[in-house]
């Protein structure tokens, strides 16, 4: 008799979930000499201890403190990329900008970027088949405590100048409800960071408006200025012209407004 | 760059080599061991970050510790020596900052003899 | 067995000739290229002459050169002089179950 299975409305775990992981782990380790002293397979186990066995809407961040330990990984504080609903175009920045890091660019951001995962109560058994959403199922589920954690110490290790890149074609600019505006924002330590600085990127080629005037960049001011840390917004009205003048800042038609 | 603290020891009877570096800080980089046995060829013992972290040869693990006891000294524990240990062991800085495993400024080397 | 094998082990060569090193990996090397070639006279400790398989160490004389990249790796000396006389070695950076340093066997260069 086949056994009862939960069936959860989010898509399942991504195939071939434990050697991928494995796998970007030696990667991320070639690419990045400093953190050669990692060991994959310690990692991986650490991962999977925190999802193994556990029901997959009561996963705590504590669940995964073992990964978060073996993956400490020091990135220059003042060197650090937020972004919110427009990750490709952040992460090819930091692809030309290297000195510059998004929470992707970090061996944790890195194994589990674009992946999904869960377990079931009691087994040993990794769920292929379903995974538990957010919203119809539960918060506390492994992927979203997962970024959660990763995020908020990403933000807390922020210093100096922090920058943002947001989307300017949503509707919510500043959105309260994604990574960004409900882990990162308060995060971000006082002592530490002087400035937030916002790069609303634009969609549309002949949209000139000032998407720094928004409500919505507006209330991440307000909620920015609260905690004493101060709040600059600049319009990126052409986010091709401007990876290309990240690329060649020689050139001539890089000092116009990008 | 300088080791310190080779001599002969009896089997079994744990040895501290000290390397010793002036004119730049281990904070900023990596240092590595490296041993020789009389005669024979290179074999890279492991590597200690300028984070303190520790990585070594499969075949180094349990039987040495490298650990910085100051800003100037790092320290290799030879655990419990044996006939083979026997080698002219040297320490040598990473060539660049959190930089690939590539040695520049290796000290003379120190000499461990292990023999009953 | 030697992760990274040299060969030959040892070769004569006249002053102004040419000498060639073979390093192959049994596996390949990180980033195709992580490679440095060293040279060790009796009693020294070695010397780095090269690094990414190809990069001249500051203060190494251009007859010394590298290439290759992946698993086969070759040092070339042109225009060979006495006091080239020394063990060369070849050192890459590995994964087995972790990354490290490993070294050829070495290969003794005889200046005639």
């Known amino acids: 008799v086949p056994r009862w299975r939960q069936q959860w409305s989010g898509p399942g775990t991504t195939k071939r979930f434990p050697e991928t992981v494995l796998a970007r782990c030696v990667k991320y380790t070639e690419i990045h000499p400093e953190m050669r002293h990692v060991d994959c397979q310690s990692v991986w186990d650490a991962f999977k201890g925190a999802f193994i066995s556990k029901h997959p809407c009561n996963i705590t961040e504590e669940d995964y403190q073992p990964l978060m330990k073996l993956g400490t990984q020091t990135v220059p504080c003042n060197k650090i990329l937020l972004w919110s609903r427009i990750k490709d175009l952040a992460h090819q920045f930091t692809q030309v900008q290297r000195d510059m890091f998004t929470l992707e660019d970090t061996l944790l951001g890195y194994l589990a970027d674009d992946l999904t995962w869960c377990g079931e109560f009691n087994t040993s058994k990794i769920n292929y088949q379903s995974c538990p959403d957010w919203r119809k199922d539960c918060s506390n589920n492994p992927v979203s405590v997962f970024w959660k954690t990763v995020s908020r110490r990403f933000a807390e290790a922020a210093c100096d100048v922090v920058h943002v890149m947001l989307n300017g074609s949503r509707s919510k600019i500043f959105d309260k409800n994604s990574t960004f505006g409900s882990v990162e924002v308060h995060n971000l330590q006082p002592e530490k960071v002087q400035t937030l600085e916002a790069w609303v990127i634009h969609g549309g080629r002949e949209d000139s408006r000032d998407l720094c005037q928004d409500p919505t960049i507006k209330e991440l001011e307000s909620i920015i200025s609260k905690r004493n840390i101060q709040f600059s917004c600049k319009n990126i009205y052409r986010p091709d012209k401007f990876l290309q003048c990240v690329k060649n800042p020689e050139d001539s038609s890089c000092t116009s407004e990008i | 760059v300088e080791e310190s603290g080779g001599r002969l020891v009896t089997p079994g009877t744990p040895l501290t080599l000290t390397c010793t570096v002036s004119g730049f800080s281990l904070s900023n980089y990596d240092m590595t061991w490296v041993r020789q046995a009389p005669g024979r060829g290179l074999e890279w013992i492991g590597v200690?970050?300028?984070?303190?972290?520790t990585n070594y040869a499969r075949w180094a693990k349990g039987r040495f510790t490298i650990s910085k006891t100051s800003s100037t000294t790092v320290d290799l524990k030879i655990t419990s020596p044996t006939t083979e240990d026997t080698a002219t062991y040297f320490c040598?800085?990473?060539?660049?900052?959190?930089?690939?495993?590539?040695?520049?400024?290796w000290g003379p080397g120190t000499l461990v003899t292990v023999s009953s | 067995a030697q992760v990274l094998t040299q060969t030959p082990s040892s070769v004569s060569a006249a002053v102004g000739g040419t000498v060639t090193i073979n390093c192959q990996s049994s596996?390949?090397?990180?980033?195709?290229?992580?490679l440095a070639w060293y040279q060790q006279k009796p009693g020294q400790p070695p010397k780095l002459l090269i690094y990414d398989a190809s990069t001249l160490a500051p203060g190494v004389p251009s007859r010394f050169s590298g290439s290759g990249s992946g698993t086969q790796f070759t040092l070339t000396i042109s225009g060979v002089q006495s006091d080239d006389a020394a063990t060369y070695y070849c050192q890459g950076t590995v994964y087995d179950s972790g990354w490290y340093a490993a070294f050829g066997g070495g290969t003794e260069v005889v200046v005639k």
């Open positions: 200690i970050s300028s984070g303190d972290n």
């Open positions: 040598a800085r990473i060539l660049y900052n959190k930089g690939r495993y590539y040695f520049t400024f």
């Open positions: 596996q390949s090397i990180a980033n195709s290229d992580e």
